[in-house]
């Protein structure tokens, strides 16, 4: 296993619709053809897997049908979008990149993006 640098923004504020997008960029030492991207969430010392996708260079990322993540790739960058976020989902979202093929296997883990999620203010009751 060889180490690889992964960069991602430190802080992102999700939209009022609970959508957060950020770029995860990795310094590929070679010409990988198969890449796996995993998003991990760290909150109160607990780390959980949010979503993961394996893709072939030049192809779209394919997450599971029920995944809250979508993404696109361009060169050594992966543009990740996480949807359906609520205030309770505020936390550190860590991008993990693995170069699966061809060998050697490389692993890179970013410092994490702190995603702040603000629940929209409830609309005041109105009489019609």
């Amino acid at each position: 296993c060889k180490a690889m640098h992964v960069a991602q923004p430190a802080v992102v504020l999700a939209s009022s619709r609970g959508i957060a997008s950020f770029v995860c960029e990795y310094a590929s030492p070679g010409k990988a053809t198969e890449v796996r991207v995993t998003v991990l969430r760290q909150a109160d010392s607990q780390v959980t897997e949010v979503c993961a996708a394996t893709y072939m260079m030049g192809n779209e990322l394919t997450f599971l049908d029920d995944s809250i993540c979508t993404g696109t790739s361009s060169g050594n960058q992966v543009n990740l979008t996480i949807q359906g976020l609520r205030a309770m989902d505020t936390g550190l979202y860590i991008c993990k990149v693995e170069l699966m093929y061809p060998p050697p296997y490389y692993l890179g883990i970013g410092n994490g993006t702190q995603i702040y999620v603000i629940d929209p203010e409830p609309c005041p009751d109105s009489d019609f």
Epitope: P9, V11, V12, L13, S15, S21, F22, A87, I118
Partner: antibody
Framework: QVQLVQSGAEVKKPGASVKVSCKAS????????ISWVRQAPGQGLEWMGW????????NYAQKLQGRVTMTTDTSTNTAYMELRSLRSDDTAVYYC??????????WGQGTLVTVSS | EIVLTQSPGTLSLSPGERATLSCRAS???????LAWYQQKPGQAPRLLIY???SRATGIPDRFSGSGSGTDFTLTISRLEPEDFAVYYC?????????FGPGTKVDIK
């Protein structure tokens, strides 16, 4: 080193608007957020809101909603806070601070805004 | 809105003494999002503690933070002359981010 430098003191009449700037240096501006906090004379700190420099999304304190606008200019690494319809109780020192993963640091030196007729 | 209450309002102590400042939240706050700041007259606030217990860069180890849930504490083990100031706690886990009213530590 990481530094935030704010614009100079302002004197405004009630009903006018003020726009305070906060120029960042020493770090990747778009990787972080900028929060704005004010402090009336002899009073405590009041959080006004913040902006994510990465995507421009904002989160404002409800009491200021509709009167405040926070923006960034990523070409100059500068954040702005505009406050409209000024009242005498808006007289305060206005601070910007970098929003990190779980901290506000560092802070700008502060900008005194005086609202007086 | 999470309301933070700080006590005491003023703490009168002598250099060398231990200072214990309290910050109580009206509802539970994730310890990841609780900070303490020091402010001296005419100066901007300075971050001391973030994540309830992590010291910010360059902060002497006489400053320590602890607590979880609704009760948080800032301790200054031995007061130095430069520590006499106002201290604020802040939560930034739930919007609106809020500050406590502050505790003034002055010379006895």
């Amino acid at each position: 080193q990481v530094q935030l430098v704010q614009s100079g003191a302002e004197v405004k009449k009630p009903g006018a608007s003020v726009k305070v700037s906060c120029k960042a240096s020493g770090y990747t501006f778009t990787s972080y957020g900028i929060s704005w906090v004010r402090q009336a004379p002899g009073q405590g700190l009041e959080w006004m809101g913040w902006i994510s420099a990465y995507n421009g999304n904002t989160n404002y304190a409800q009491k200021l909603q509709g009167r405040v606008t926070m923006t960034t200019d990523t070409s100059t690494n500068t954040a702005y806070m505009e406050l409209r319809s000024l009242r005498s109780d808006d007289t305060a020192v206005y601070y910007c601070a970098r929003v990190g993963a779980n901290w506000f640091d560092p802070w700008g030196q502060g900008t005194l805004v005086t609202v007086s007729s | 809105e999470i309301v933070l209450t700080q006590s005491p309002g003023t703490l009168s102590l002598s250099p060398g003494e231990r200072a214990t400042l309290s910050c109580r939240a009206s509802q539970s706050v994730s310890s990841s999002y609780l900070a303490w700041y020091q402010q001296k007259p005419g100066q901007a606030p300075r971050l001391l503690i973030y994540g309830a217990s992590s010291r910010a860069t360059g902060i002497p180890d006489r400053f320590s933070g602890s607590g979880s849930g609704t009760d948080f504490t800032l301790t200054i083990s031995r007061l130095e002359p430069e520590d006499f100031a106002v201290y604020y706690c802040q939560q930034y886990g739930i919007s609106p981010f809020t500050f406590g009213p502050g505790t003034k530590v002055d010379i006895k």
